[in-house]
């Protein structure tokens, strides 16, 4: 039997400079594309190798992006969120929520769709 799984949630402001190929990550989520049950938030689903986000090193797959340049990402359609990032300019400020899994007891299994990874 697996031990109880807890999560340590932290927030961080990440400032990225758009690189030659952009910001370098993929997102899932939105009011029309719920990735996490009962949560229409925007989550990072992929960090592109050698992209701006990967080179910065702080943004991680599974992070929830709360805002872009101070603009809240709550209640956005998926494509509207994508467009917001694409039009965010050269210097992009992301407010992100990291969700770190803290294992109590035997190691559990983290499945696809879990925002922690």
């Amino acid at each position: 039997m697996n031990g109880r799984v807890d999560y340590l949630v932290t927030e961080e402001e990440i400032n990225l400079t758009r690189g030659p190929s952009g910001l370098g990550f993929n997102i899932v989520g939105g009011t029309d594309q719920q990735y996490v049950s009962n949560d229409s938030g925007i989550y990072v689903s992929r960090i592109k190798e050698n992209g701006a986000a990967a080179l910065d090193g702080r943004l991680q797959e599974g992070d929830k992006i709360l805002s872009v340049n101070g603009q809240d990402l709550k209640n956005l359609l998926h494509q509207d969120a994508v467009d917001l990032f694409r039009n965010a300019g050269y210097a992009v400020s992301l407010r992100v929520q990291h969700r770190l899994q803290v294992q109590n007891g035997p190691i559990g299994h983290r499945g696809e769709g879990d925002p922690s990874g």
Partner: nanobody, 126 residues
Amino acid sequence: EVQLVESGGGLVQPGGSLRLSCTASGRTFSTYTMAWFRQAPGKEREFVAAITWSGTYYADSVKGRFTISRDNAKNTMYLQMNSLKPEDTAVYICAAVIGSTVDSYSPSDPLEYDYWGQGTQVTVSS
């Protein structure tokens, strides 16, 4: 890890039709950006079509003849191929990535995708 399995290939006469399927593992299939590529013997891998949350994309060589679609309930993407030509002969490979890029999307760039199937052979010959 996402697994992709293609099916539906075969031998068809010029002018004929085939429907290819690509079935994917994972409960978040609806979020995947997916594409079809093809590779003929001795040739480079070539983009055919892609489907994202917001739309579809086609190579000029298949526009008006091929249609890409998906059924999220079945975790399956399709490629309906009509008016097939001998030059469509190739191994057809499906590709996927979870989510949408926040950058300019280049559907024909293989680096846009993380997961690849093994392919299904399509031969157009009389």
